[in-house]
């Protein structure tokens, strides 16, 4: 029996192929076998099928990086990493995606889900669209909706200062942030650390954070697979 999706375009299609263990998988942008991309799939959180595109867990990876690094991606997909803005832009251009953010700290956990998530192309400076919040972490991403991505060497924020420079990270900064998941790991100084404002505020750096995405219609696809 052939696979449902011989060239899965995301982790949800990998899951629908029968792969239910979290780990590294190859996906294919637009189902094109020449556009292979290795990703980490979270197959357990809220039904699974998530492409993880950011993980913070121990501070071993340097996230204070330039525009080129954030465009391309960096790090070890099994450990701390950033998948890359170019990849995110291509993936979210495939259809309607949702965003999930998982946060953990000293036994506590919280999450945020956004029904509609996309990252624009390089021309838009990877403009963020994030709408339709639900969850327990608080709607901190709302503030960043519509913003372009900023790094210390490409300042696209609306602040007088360079937000990425001031807070030693990179993000879809406005003036400056309510979310700083690419901030300095373990730094509890105001606004410098791994922050999700409406959960732990700006004076506490969160121990574990993941950002992930999957098709917004995943529930329907999953139901179809089960019926089949």
């Amino acid at each position: 029996i052939g696979l449902l999706y011989p060239f899965p375009r995301d982790c949800s299609q990998a899951m629908l192929n029968g792969d239910t263990t979290s780990g590294l998988y190859t996906i294919y942008i637009n189902g094109d076998k020449t556009q292979a991309l290795e990703v980490y799939c979270d197959m357990t959180s809220d039904g699974g099928g998530w492409i993880v595109f950011l993980r913070r867990k121990n501070g071993r990876e340097d996230f204070y990086r330039n525009w080129k690094a954030y465009a391309a991606g960096f790090g070890d997909r099994r450990e701390e990493f950033w998948l890359g803005l170019d990849n995110l832009s291509k993936i979210t251009a495939q259809g309607q995606y949702e965003l999930r953010v998982d946060l953990q700290d000293h036994g506590e956990s919280a999450y945020a889900v956004y029904d509609r998530f996309s990252v624009g192309d390089a021309k838009s400076r990877y403009k963020l669209k994030v709408e339709g919040y639900s969850g327990t972490a608080g709607d901190s991403m709302n503030y960043h909706n519509g913003r372009s991505f900023s790094t210390y060497d490409k300042d696209t924020d609306s602040a007088i200062t360079n937000c990425a420079l001031s807070y030693k990270g990179a993000f879809w900064y406005k003036n400056c942030h309510r979310v700083n998941l690419m901030g300095r790991y373990g730094d509890n100084n105001h606004s410098q650390g791994v922050n999700w404002f409406h959960w732990k505020g700006h004076e506490y750096s969160i121990q574990f954070a993941e950002m992930k995405l999957r098709p917004s219609n995943f529930r329907n696809l999953e139901g179809r697979r089960k019926r089949a």
């Epitope: 909706n145 007088i160 003036n175 606004s191 700006h202």
Partner: antibody, heavy 120, light 107 residues
Amino acid sequence: QVQLVESGGGLVQPGRSLRLSCAASGFTFDDYAMHWVRQAPGKGLEWVSGISGSGGSTYYADSVKGRFTISRDNAKNSLYLQMNSLRAEDTALYYCAKSYQSDEDAFDIWGQGTMVTVSS
Amino acid sequence: DIQMTQSPASLPTPVGDRVTITCRASQYIQGFLNWYQQKPGKAPKLLIYDASNLETGVPSRFSGSGSGTDFTLTISSLQPEDFATYYCQQSYSTPQTFGQGTKVDIK
């Protein structure tokens, strides 16, 4: 053009209730958080309450928590403030205001205000 | 709650002069600071958002600066239509709070 028009103010006795309305036009109403801000006669501005674009999140000043309820009807492009157990110190001009972008943000559009007087 | 302290409370100024109003937050608020102008009998009008961004349609003689806890609104050359009360507001956290206002009147 973008416009906010408040209504529902008036003279009310202490302990009674009043419901303010704000009719919005000229923008996609459900895309924006909305707020109520008040100004007592001869005094400064005081934020009262806010609500997210979907209506899923609501916020209140401590001075009105448990007495006032903010709500919205996106189908009618309308914002409301239900004010119960009114006190003399609630006497003010009540403004409806649109959030610039996110829930906690600058207020870029304001209505003309509706006066609430609480007196026996 | 975050307290916002404006100074001065009153500022008599001749037309054409430079005006500087300061606003101090009781805690660090990044750049989450907005400025409004209010004329008697009128609703407030947004002038500056996010500390330094001029709202559309606001004359370029208005400017904002500052970050963290200390912020400034500057009118480079006061015009007759600028006589009004000016308020700062923090949008860093709920409840959003306003300064007590600075009344700029004719000297």
